[in-house]
């Protein structure tokens, strides 16, 4: 099974690498452009269906964009010697739809990886970390790009989507040292709520075209660095007052939160008093209320409390058939 | 009821400026954004940007950039939309809506004909 | 920009009938679509917000559906005044883009 594989040793791999003849410094692979100057490999569009093995010790930044990986196996980029001077991996729209424990190890350098686009079946909870144990060696990893990697309703697994995601997230607490963070088009409907705890370091993190419907179970308290949130895009109803103390005591923090179907309530009210006099909504006076349709339109900013009410719910006996 | 009125039809040469209007009557209307429309005929419904009255914030469609400007005047309840350096290609009915996630009540549409 | 398009530019029905209008995205736009009402004197009406949700004052002979990128609004009776032509807008990103409109005709 996935779970199996994933949690198998990468030590056999490294083994058959170590007895082939270490990759000549200045060769390039099959179906790939290199520039030594560039330090930049790029095998793109290739339909290649594993990861090449004599790539060069100068990469520094690898694209492996639009080919047909299908599985990232543990060690799939360990070399003899290591390749240690890549930082930049680009594995966006590779079909990839099973990324097993270890796959990334032995990349000392590796701090932007990108696997957009790639429909995950399975994320091995040991991905990024690399190790099943409890506290990992730090990964170098300061920027994480996984958006649209949300398979289709037929290949996922019974778990939970966004559990999957977050426990590769969080797994050894390996990225401590994240700054980037991006989790975009991914259908997520709720947001775990122990994931962003474990990334302290996070400057951006963008959360944009999903399903997130609240974030009253989220806790953004100790991303005293945030810099750019993005929200832009769910299905949010309304933030209330933790949330938005919580966003006002982040020092650096632009919140963007276009295109959400607000529902301008008496529940909204804690929301309009916080925008008006907020600084951190960037394009605050483009949020409008969605429903309900008396209020469809209505530009938040410009509310009163008098505009947001409730409807009475009546008790059974007074309710009529 | 909501209506939005808009200023009537206007004949102007090429490379002049022409500033429509479009009275707000029935609703708070400092309180919703009021958008400008475009419709040549063969070319169907064109937004051209957006702003909201109050604030004086604006948004414009990157094809109409330097060509539109849009401004507002509270007391009256008018929106403005100044056309600039006329060319036959802005001939067309131009409509002011009430929106912003739709359109909700329109103008009746102000010809602007440019010709030499 | 998204793109909008409505391959029925014209459409012919007769009065009673049920007529389905079609409208696609070139990428998913949420449910984020409107429909609109031009009759030929001008006058602008809308008819469906947010995919389904009818405007107050439509008829309810008038109804919308669909999701991704494909939407239609149908019109389950024909009826003289429906004589126009129908426009989709999506409201998912700017700039907000409309189809290219499809004029229904009476047989």
């Known amino acids: 099974t996935s779970s199996a594989s994933s949690s198998s040793s990468s030590a056999p791999f490294l083994a058959s690498a170590a007895s082939a003849q270490p990759p000549l410094p200045d060769q390039c692979p099959a179906l790939c452009e290199c520039s030594e100057a560039a330090r930049t490999v790029k095998c793109v569009n290739r339909n290649l269906t594993e990861v090449p093995t004599d790539l060069p010790l100068y990469v520094r930044n690898l694209f492996l964009t639009g080919n047909q990986l299908a599985v990232l196996p543990a060690g799939a980029f360990a070399r003899r010697p290591p390749l240690a001077e890549l930082a930049a991996l680009n594995l966006s729209g590779s079909r990839l739809d099973e990324v097993r424990g270890g796959a990334f190890e032995h990349l000392p350098s590796l701090r932007q990886l990108d696997l957009s686009h790639n429909p995950l079946a399975y994320l091995s909870p040991f991905a990024f970390s690399g190790s099943n144990a409890s506290i990992s060696a730090p990964s170098p990893l300061v920027e994480l790009i996984l958006n649209h990697i949300v398979p289709p309703d037929d290949k996922r697994q019974n778990r939970s989507f966004e559990g999957m995601v977050a426990a590769a997230l969080v797994a050894g607490r390996a990225l401590q040292g994240l700054h980037l963070l991006e989790l975009a088009s991914n259908h997520f409907l709720y947001l775990p709520r122990d994931v962003l705890a474990q990334l302290p370091s996070l400057r951006y993190l963008d959360l944009s075209n999903n399903s997130l419907v609240s974030l009253t179970y989220v806790s953004f308290r100790n991303l005293t660095h945030l810099e750019s949130l993005h929200l832009e895009d769910n299905a949010l109803k309304v933030l209330h007052n933790g949330t938005l103390a919580e966003l006002q005591g982040l020092p650096h923090v632009r919140v963007f939160l276009d295109n959400n179907p607000w529902v301008c309530d008496c529940h909204m009210a804690d929301m309009v008093t916080w925008l008006k006099q907020t600084g951190v909504v960037q394009g605050k006076d483009r949020l409008t209320c969605a429903f309900p349709e008396k209020m469809r339109n209505r530009v938040l900013l410009e509310l009163n409390s008098a505009d947001l009410d409730c409807d009475p719910i009546l008790p059974p006996s007074l309710q009529t058939s | 009821q909501v209506q939005l009125q808009q200023s009537g039809a206007e004949l102007m040469k090429p490379g002049a400026s022409v500033k429509l209007s479009c009275k707000a009557t029935g609703y708070t209307f400092t309180g919703y954004w009021i958008e400008w429309i475009k419709q040549r005929p063969g070319h169907g419904l064109e937004w051209i940007g957006e702003?909201?009255?109050?604030?004086?914030?604006?948004d414009y469609n990157e094809k109409f950039k330097g060509k539109a400007t849009f401004t507002a005047d509270t007391s009256s309840n008018t929106a403005y939309m100044q056309l600039s350096s006329l060319t036959t290609e802005d001939s067309a009915i131009y409509y002011c809506?009430?929106?912003?996630?739709?359109?909700?009540?329109w103008g009746q549409g102000t010809l602007v004909t440019v010709s030499a | 920009d998204i793109q909008m398009t409505q391959t029925t530019s014209s459409l012919s029905a007769s009065l009673g009938d049920r007529v389905t209008i079609s409208c696609s995205a070139s990428?998913?736009?949420?449910?984020?679509l409107n429909w609109y009402q031009q009759k030929p004197d001008g006058t602008v009406k809308l008819l469906i917000y947010?995919?389904?949700s009818l405007h107050s004052g439509v008829p309810s002979r008038f109804s919308g559906s669909g999701s991704g990128t494909d939407y239609s609004l149908t019109i389950s009776n024909l009826e003289p005044e429906d004589i126009a032509t129908y426009y989709c807008q999506q409201y998912s990103k700017v700039p907000w883009t409309f189809g290219g409109g499809t004029k229904l005709e009476i047989k």
């Open positions: 947010y995919t389904s």
């Open positions: 990428q998913g736009i949420r449910n984020y």
């Open positions: 702003i909201l009255p109050g604030r004086g914030s604006t």
């Open positions: 809506t009430r929106g912003r996630l739709d359109f909700t009540y």
